[in-house]
């Protein structure tokens, strides 16, 4: 599932490049392992912002699929309460390219620990 999430992220990146969306998004660029589920939640919430701002059907479908995949991969630990983690709004705001790069990085963290 996580490998498919990465391919969806690359698809979103390709779609966005042709659209010139210049939104800034809350981005966790240095994820601590004990906060990775919280960080994933922030990434997914921000991804929905991209979908809404783009108004593009392909981006919408890909984001929705990515959320479904992530949900299923995290169904066992998605409700784990992680303490001492930053709220989404406390994270740095970065451009979409940097946001997606950081997103791929956190997904790789999940791949490495699964």
């Amino acid at each position: 599932n996580w490998v498919n999430v990465i391919s969806d992220l690359k698809k979103i990146e390709d779609l966005i490049q042709s659209m010139h969306i210049d939104a800034t998004l809350y981005t966790e660029s240095d994820v601590h392992p004990s906060c990775k589920v919280t960080a994933m939640k922030c990434f997914l919430l921000e991804l929905q912002v991209i979908s809404l701002e783009s108004g593009d059907a392909s981006i919408h479908d890909t984001v929705e699929n990515l959320i479904i995949l992530a949900n299923n991969s995290l169904s066992s630990n998605g409700n784990v309460t992680e303490s001492g983690c930053k709220e989404c709004e406390e994270l740095e705001e970065k451009n979409i390219k940097e946001f997606l790069q950081s997103f791929v990085h956190i997904v790789q963290m999940f791949i490495n620990t699964s």
């Epitope: 929905q48 059907a57 919408h60 479908d61 890909t62 699929n65 479904i68 949900n71 998605g78 409700n79």
Partner: antibody, heavy 122, light 112 residues
Framework: EVRLMASGGGLVQPGGSLRLSCAAS????????MSWVRQAPGKGLEWVST????????YYPDSVKGRFTISRDNSKNTLYLQMNSLRAEDTAVYYC???????????????WGQGTLVTVSS | DVVMTQSPLSLPVTLGQPASISCRSS???????????LEWYQQRPGQSPRLLIY???NRFSGVPDRFSGSGSGTDFTLKISRVEAEDVGVYYC?????????FGQGTKLEIK
Amino acid sequence: EVRLMASGGGLVQPGGSLRLSCAASEFTFSNYAMSWVRQAPGKGLEWVSTISRGGDYTYYPDSVKGRFTISRDNSKNTLYLQMNSLRAEDTAVYYCARRVSMITGGWAMDYWGQGTLVTVSS
Amino acid sequence: DVVMTQSPLSLPVTLGQPASISCRSSQSIVDITGNTYLEWYQQRPGQSPRLLIYKVFNRFSGVPDRFSGSGSGTDFTLKISRVEAEDVGVYYCFQDSFVPYTFGQGTKLEIK
């Protein structure tokens, strides 16, 4: 008023194939994900499949995965369910349903068609 | 897979009286983004299912306000404040937080 009309049901032998259709009208079909849900005679509801708005993403339970294929033709406002290698336990009324977006709404099936009966028997 | 268990399976109610149906999931159905995709559907005799409640407590358009949904995590409830004759049918809870999406077995509401 949203309209969904399922058709294509009938009697088929075990191991046979059938293609169901669902004609949609009175809404912008391409703006919605769609699902199939079935109900065996006298039994409860079972989710069968969901397809994304553009048709790129499809989802199935293990009970039909590899045998059933959901697809759509947005130019014809039509949803399909191709059913292969049919078994007696696939006998059911099949309903098509419109899905509200996960991102903009509640991810629920807000409108349902009237259903078409599929009977698998020799 | 998430198993949805409803109770009771049969619910005889006097007209004008309240009714309550419970639905319990085998694991939490709160998704990673914090949403709980739990719906309630009504199926009247001989009819297609109809959406009543989505995301636990949101009433769908046109649904009478005597229907209400509540709950969180793994325990959910559908309440009908005053049962009317047209409420007869089978009620299903449904989770679509995690694939495969799953229905409860259904609760048959009948008039005493």
